[in-house]
């Protein structure tokens, strides 16, 4: 695949180890942590990226109202179990045998239990709402220009098909990007909205996953956009199952 042949690196994932040991001496890259081969012509799955992140040395984070079933990733980082395709396994457990069910973006969608907890299927996150607040800017952003620039970003940088960017809302200083992708809509080779959202989230935090690129420079008619706060809401095809105790907390 298209890892850079000359110096054998993975353009879409710097959390890899690459060597020219593929067929015919081609460059092959493996994700840190899992050792799984990755396709450097597209985004790496969030599960493999999280696993790589946990294995890496630690350094000495008119607008839409999120649905009542929307999940926010409050649990933070964990070392996930990934299936052979690099997707999250439906059930995740930690070293103390505490288990929980996750959705396709790896966010917990049930109460925590023990090893007897069953997660019958990996429930797909089909709607992601990215809520940003930009810092004050000298020049105002035009909504249609902002919309076009964000759609261009997801298409060109994250290789997400334009049809999956459902809407861009703007009420200064809040920007909301809606990504939608049902199981039936996602064809082979399509970037998953969860992976695109994760790459975007890391870019926005100044932690780009791309090899050798500087930070993301996002401009609208030349005016730089700087982000002060990010919140991401995840909506699953099947609503999450939490106890009433958690919902009233």
């Amino acid at each position: 695949h298209t890892a850079a042949q000359d110096n054998c690196t993975c353009p879409t994932n710097k959390m890899t180890v690459c060597s020219p040991d593929g067929p015919g001496g081609r460059c092959q890259c493996r994700a840190l942590g899992s050792g799984m081969a990755v396709d450097c012509s597209t985004l790496t799955s969030k599960c493999l990226l999280l696993k790589a992140r946990m294995s890496a040395p630690k350094n000495a984070r008119t607008l839409v109202r999120p649905s009542e079933h929307a999940l926010v990733d409050n649990d933070g980082l964990y070392d996930p179990d990934c299936d052979p395709e690099g997707r999250f396994k439906a059930r995740q457990c930690n070293q103390t045998s505490v288990c929980w069910c996750v959705n396709s973006v790896g966010v917990r969608r049930t109460d925590k239990g023990d090893l007897s907890l069953r997660c019958d299927e990996l429930v797909r996150t089909h709607h992601i709402l990215i809520d940003l607040r930009h810092r004050p800017t000298a020049g105002a952003f035009n909504h249609s220009d902002l919309d076009a620039e964000l759609r261009r970003l997801f298409r060109e940088r994250y290789r997400l098909h334009p049809k999956f960017v459902a809407a861009v809302h703007y009420e200064q200083p809040t920007i909301q990007i809606e990504l939608r992708q049902n199981t039936s809509q996602k064809a082979a080779g399509d970037v998953d909205i969860g992976d695109a959202a994760y790459y975007f989230e890391r870019d926005i935090k100044g932690e780009s996953l791309f090899q050798g690129r500087g930070g993301l420079d996002l401009r609208v008619r030349g005016e730089p956009l700087q982000v002060e706060r990010t919140l991401i809401y995840y909506l699953d095809e099947i609503p999450p199952k939490f106890s009433m105790k958690r919902l009233t907390a």
């Epitope: 000298a138 870019d203 930070g215 730089p224 700087q226």
Partner: antibody, heavy 122, light 106 residues
Framework: EVQLQQSGPDLVRPGASVKLSCKAS????????INWVKQRPGQGLEWIGW????????KYNEKFKGKATLTVDTSSSTAYMEVHSLTSEDSAVYFC???????????????WGQGTSVTVSS | AIVLTQSPAIMSASPGEKVTMTCSAS?????IYWYQRKPGSSPRLLIY???NLASGVPVRFSGSGSGTSYSLTISRMEAEDAATYYC?????????FGAGTKLELK
């Protein structure tokens, strides 16, 4: 190393125009805006405007609209500023400076060109 | 336009002395940028986004402030710090600079 190289000093007649150049090297020219700043002898710094080479977007200080015109030639990584209808008030050192930015920070004007001295005299 | 007033206009300091200069904005700004200019040289960025040190700038320089009041501090004056210092705002157009603080070596 990021560098901006400006054209040499110019002595021009009142009423004429002058076109100053600023050649960029050491980075992707289209990735950051080029700003122009004026400094008259013994005076402070005055922002004229910026141009973003990737799409040609421009922003001018209202005071310099009609007085200065900003353009770029991406093929040679060069920014230009033409100053029109020159008077003694336009005698100054003109600097170009690039501004890098990411979604995290605005990195300010860095680096600056060495400046071009323009003297308007008959 | 936002007016930036720098004070003092001129000051002098001995080597090793702590130096503080201020920049006051006519209306609230979110960030301030500081530049150093020596005679015969072009301006050099020192501080971006109020408090971040630009690449290659000695750690004796620091910036702070919020709203309408900002400052640049040199923890220990060195001979090479003699220069004129300008603050600048990027909050609204036109971008404006202060008139400068000239720092001389005592």
């Amino acid at each position: 190393e990021v560098q901006l190289q400006q054209s040499g000093p110019d002595l021009v007649r009142p009423g004429a125009s002058v076109k100053l150049s600023c050649k960029a090297s050491g980075y992707t020219f289209t990735s950051s805006d080029i700003n122009w700043v004026k400094q008259r002898p013994g005076q402070g710094l005055e922002w004229i405007g910026w141009i973003y080479p990737r799409d040609g977007s421009k922003k001018y200080n209202e005071k310099f609209k009609g007085k200065a015109t900003l353009t770029v030639d991406t093929s040679s990584s060069t920014a230009y500023m033409e100053v029109h209808s020159l008077t003694s008030e336009d005698s100054a050192v003109y600097f170009c400076a690039t501004r890098f930015a990411t979604v995290v920070s605005n990195y300010g004007l860095d680096p600056w060109g060495q400046g071009t001295s323009v003297t308007v005299s008959s | 336009a936002i007016v930036l007033t720098q004070s003092p206009a001129i000051m002098s300091a001995s080597p090793g002395e702590k130096v503080t200069m201020t920049c006051s904005a006519s209306s609230s700004v979110n960030y301030i940028y500081w530049y150093q200019r020596k005679p015969g040289s072009s301006p050099r960025l020192l501080i971006y986004d109020t408090s971040n040190l630009a690449s290659g700038v000695p750690v004796r320089f620091s910036g702070s402030g919020s709203g309408t009041s900002y400052s640049l501090t040199i923890s220990r004056m060195e001979a090479e710090d003699a220069a004129t210092y300008y603050c600048q705002q990027w909050n609204s157009y036109p971008l404006t600079f202060g008139a400068g603080t000239k720092l001389e070596l005592k």
